[in-house]
Amino acid sequence: NFMYSKTVKRLSKLREYQQYHPSLTCVMEGKDIEDWSCCPTPWTSFQSSCYFISTGMQSWTKSQKNCSVMGADLVVINTREEQDFIIQNLKRNSSYFLGLSDPGGRRHWQWVDQTPYNENVTFWHSGEPNNLDERCAIINFRSSEEWGWNDIHCHVPQKSICKMKKIYI
């Protein structure tokens, strides 16, 4: 029976993934009962990705390692719509690391997942980035401009946002 074997495979995958993320929240995508997309609980989902707001305060490097151990990366923001989704889950009095850095301090910004940096899809606060020694990017709230990006020193502990592709089972 096709449906039975599909269910057995799905349960097997769930068991395999459970040691890394003990609880998954899954939805059926489209009309096909075969396609389930999942995010770890309590991650949030938007389009084809899952997001986790890490409230522990860590340096940029440690924040990225924390994400990667979970099978994710610090968030790479590709569109205004994605940023608008993300900020719904952020606190205005906090700052959060993005997966964006300038390791050489030469204003060669690069995303942690090698996505090409596109100047046309950036959301820097006005006047930012403004310091060659500030080589990591955060997203934070300024009352005059709402949410935007700022460059800061990478060693200064911040909260962070992890992102990974949805898990398909």
């Epitope: 395999e16 990225q64 990667s68 979970m70 099978g71 990366d73 942690v112 997942d113 090698q114």
Partner: nanobody, 127 residues
Framework: QVQLQESGGGLVQAGDSLRLSCAAS????????MGWFRQAPGKEREFVAA????????NYRDSVKGRFTISRDNDLNAGYLQMNSLKPEDTAVYYC????????????????????WGQGTQVTVSS
Amino acid sequence: QVQLQESGGGLVQAGDSLRLSCAASGDTFSMYTMGWFRQAPGKEREFVAAISRSGGSTNYRDSVKGRFTISRDNDLNAGYLQMNSLKPEDTAVYYCALRLTFSTTTAYTGELQYPYWGQGTQVTVSS
């Protein structure tokens, strides 16, 4: 906790071949994307090759395409880097790295995307 151990490095002549191995322990190897990176003296560590969980997807840096082949054996908890037509500029310490992933087809290329690293094995290519 994942542990990695590279082997197979050595001193060879330009044009020769070497096969590097990476033995993994501590977790289910098939849940991890594997990458090889290298660091030459005085230079930054750079991506060499990566292979997806299933082995079906690979990525290579341009300078090694056609000469190096990455592979893995999930039953043996091991990964490999076959290096042919070696050049003096391939001289470096070679590191294997692992990254948990839930996609069977993704081969990550970013150094910071890999949290688990081996100690490295030295490859020296003389002219």
